[in-house]
Amino acid sequence: EHPTADRAGCSASGACYSLHHATMKRQAAEEACILRGGALSTVRAGAELRAVLALLRAGPGPGGGSKDLLFWVALERRRSHCTLENEPLRGFSWLSSDPGGLESDTLQWVEEPQRSCTARRCAVLQATGGVEPAGWKEMRCHLRANGYLCKYQFEVLCPAPRPGAASNLSYRAPFQLHSAALDFSPPGTEVSALCRGQLPISVTCIADEIGARWDKLSGDVLCPCPGRYLRAGKCAELPNCLDDLGGFACECATGFELGKDGRSCVTSGEGQPTLGGTGVPTRRPPATATSPVPQRTWPIRVDEKLGETPLVPEQDNSVTSIPEIPRWGSQSTMSTLQMSLQAESKATITPSGSVISKFNSTTSSATPQAFDSSSA
C-alpha cells in the first residue's frame, strides 16, 4: 500500500493537492495518484502554484530538511516536441484536459533542460531543503524522485465543522490522509472528536443533489458549548470576546442571539442583555467582502481562481454520497486556504464571514451577473 499523504490542502474551488514523500519513478507516481482518485498534479500559475508552495513550506519531509528534494509533477516534453529556450516552460507542457492558460507566472528552471526534439523528457519540482521551491528540473522519466504531488477535483466540499466544546479532533479523509485540521473536506471524510465528559462524536461529510454537509451535525458545531459564546468556532467566555480594538469578536451559541445592545448574547427571544463588549457579532447574514481576513469565519465568498485548473474526478453517483477528496490545510499558523485567500481572493471573508462561492470570473467583480454579463 502507498504511504499516506504527508500533507494536503484544497481551495474553495474544489481543487485539492497532496504531497507525498516516497522514492519512485514517474509512472509509479502517476499510478499512486490515480489510486487515490486523483492525478499527478499540474502546478500552473497563480493560485495553483501558491497552493502547492504552501504545502511544501509547511515543513520538511523525512530527513529533516537537510537536502534538496525532487517531486514528480505532471510536466513533460513529448517525444516529437522540441526544447524551446525562450518559452517559460521550455517546450514542456502540463498534462491536463483543461484548455491552456498563461504560463508566464511560473517557477524558474533550476537547470536549463537539454536541447532535444526526439526523446520524451519528464520534469520535477525541486525543493531546497525539501521545503523551499527552487524551480523545475528536467529528469529522465525512469529515474526515481523523492516524492510526488497529486491533484484532485471536486464539485463540492464540506467546510470544517466548528469545534465548539470538542477536543482531540481527528480528520480521516478518503485518500489516506489523517490530520488534526482541515478547512475543507471531501465527501467521505470522517471527523471524530471528544465532547465534554470524554463522549466520542463522529460526523461524516456527505454529498447529494443539494450540496455537501456533515451528517449527524446539529448547528454547525461538533459539541455544544456550555455557555453563550463562540470565538473562532470554539467555546469562549464573554471576557475573551473582545478583540484588540475592543470590538466584539464572538458569535452567539445555538439558542442565543445578539442582544439589542449588540454586545452580548441573550436567550433567543429575550430582551436587553446586561453584560457587554463592543462592536458587532460574528454571526450575521451572508455578505460579500473585497479584502481577505486571516481568520477563517463563515459564510465566505471566494473567487474560484483559488483552485484554477482541475484535473480529476468528482466521483458521485446520482443522489447518493460522493466519495470525493479533501481540502486540507497544513498545521502551520495559517492554513493553505487562508494563504490562498490572502494571496488571491477578490472576494472574501468578512469578520462575520461572508459567502464563498466556487466562482472564477476573470473580472474583479464577485457579483453574479447573468452568465452572459452583457445581459446583467
Epitope: A12, S13, G14, A15, S97, D98, P99, Y152, Q153, F154, E155, V156, L157, C158, P159, A160, P161, R162, E209, I210, G211, A212, R213, W214, L217, D220, P285, P286, W298, P299, I300, R301, E304, G307, E308, T309, P310, V312, P313, E314, Q315, D316, N317, S318, V319, I322, E324, V355, I356, S357, K358, F359, N360, S361, T362, T363, P368, Q369, A370, F371
Partner: antibody, heavy 127, light 106 residues
Framework: EVQGVESGGGLVQPKGSLKLSCAAS????????MHWVCQAPGKGLEWVAR??????????YYADSVKDRFTISRDDSQSMLYLQMNNLKTEDTAMYYC??????????????????WGQGTSVTVSS | EIVLTQSPAIMSASPGEKVTITCSAS?????MHWFQQKPGTSPKLWIY???NLASGVPARFSGSGSGTSYSLTISRMEAEDAATYYC????????TFGAPGKLELK
C-alpha cells in the same frame, strides 16, 4: 468575464433535430456541472438536463419530457456544452439557456445553485 | 415530481410597501432557491439555500421557510424590484421551478 454564449437555435419541423451549443468562458469550465433550462414564450422556467463534470464521470440527468429524445454532452477541452435535440415536438418551442452550477459555502455546508445563465438561444418547432 | 406552487401569480406593490411571495411544495424539500427575471433578460440567482442572498442582491430581500412552505420577502418595495420571481427545488429529480410570480410596481 464569465460568459456563456448559446447558438444553434432556429426553426425546425416537428420530428426534426437540432443541436444547441454553449461556448463558456471566464471560468474553469471542466470543474463545473452544467444545465440546460428552457422557457416557452410567455411561460415559466423548465429544467431540461444536467451533466456533471469529469470527476463525477460526466453523469447525466434529464426531465421526463425529454428523456430518450435529448442528449446533453460537453467538451471540456473546448469549454463547450451541447444539447442534441431529436424527434422535436411543437411543445419544445422555447428559449434554451445554458446554466452553470455554482457551489456556495455557508456554515458547515456547501450548496449547489444555478448561478450563471447564458443569454439563451431560441428554438421554434413548427410545420 | 415535486410541484412548486407560487402565489400570488401577479401582484402590484407601491414603493416602500412590504411584499411577500410564497412557494408551496407538494412534498417536503430541504432548501429553496429563488431567481429574478426581468423582461428580455436571463434569470439571475437571487436567493440560494432558502435564506442566503446572492451577491449584489439588496439587503431588503430575505428568504425563509422549511419543509413545504417557503417565502421571499421584500421589506420595502422599490421600482427596480419589479420583475418575475421563481422558486426552485433541487431535493429530487426532476429539478422543478415554481410558476412565474410577477411583481409589478403600483
Amino acid at each position: 468575464e464569465v460568459q456563456g454564449v448559446e447558438s444553434g437555435g432556429g426553426l425546425v419541423q416537428p420530428k426534426g433535430s437540432l443541436k444547441l451549443s454553449c461556448a463558456a468562458s471566464g471560468f474553469t469550465f471542466n470543474t463545473y456541472a452544467m444545465h440546460w433550462v428552457c422557457q416557452a414564450p410567455g411561460k415559466g422556467l423548465e429544467w431540461v438536463a444536467r451533466i456533471r463534470s469529469k470527476s463525477n464521470n460526466y453523469a447525466t440527468y434529464y426531465a421526463d419530457s425529454v428523456k430518450d429524445r435529448f442528449t446533453i454532452s460537453r467538451d471540456d477541452s473546448q469549454s463547450m456544452l451541447y444539447l442534441q435535440m431529436n424527434n422535436l415536438k411543437t411543445e419544445d418551442t422555447a428559449m434554451y439557456y445554458c446554466v452553470r452550477e455554482g457551489v456556495y459555502y455557508y456554515g458547515s455546508s456547501g450548496y449547489y445553485a444555478m448561478d450563471y445563465w447564458g443569454q439563451g438561444t431560441s428554438v421554434t418547432v413548427s410545420s | 415530481e415535486i410541484v412548486l406552487t407560487q402565489s400570488p401569480a401577479i401582484m402590484s406593490a407601491s414603493p416602500g410597501e412590504k411584499v411577500t411571495i410564497t412557494c408551496s411544495a407538494s412534498s417536503s424539500v430541504s432548501y429553496m432557491h429563488w431567481f429574478q427575471q426581468k423582461p428580455g433578460t436571463s434569470p439571475k440567482l437571487w436567493i440560494y439555500s432558502t435564506s442566503n442572498l446572492a451577491s449584489g442582491v439588496p439587503a431588503r430581500f430575505s428568504g425563509s421557510g422549511s419543509g413545504t412552505s417557503y417565502s421571499l420577502t421584500i421589506s420595502r418595495m422599490e421600482a427596480e424590484d419589479a420583475a418575475t420571481y421563481y422558486c426552485q427545488q433541487r431535493s429530487s429529480y426532476p429539478l422543478t421551478f415554481g410558476a412565474p410570480g410577477k411583481l409589478e410596481l403600483k
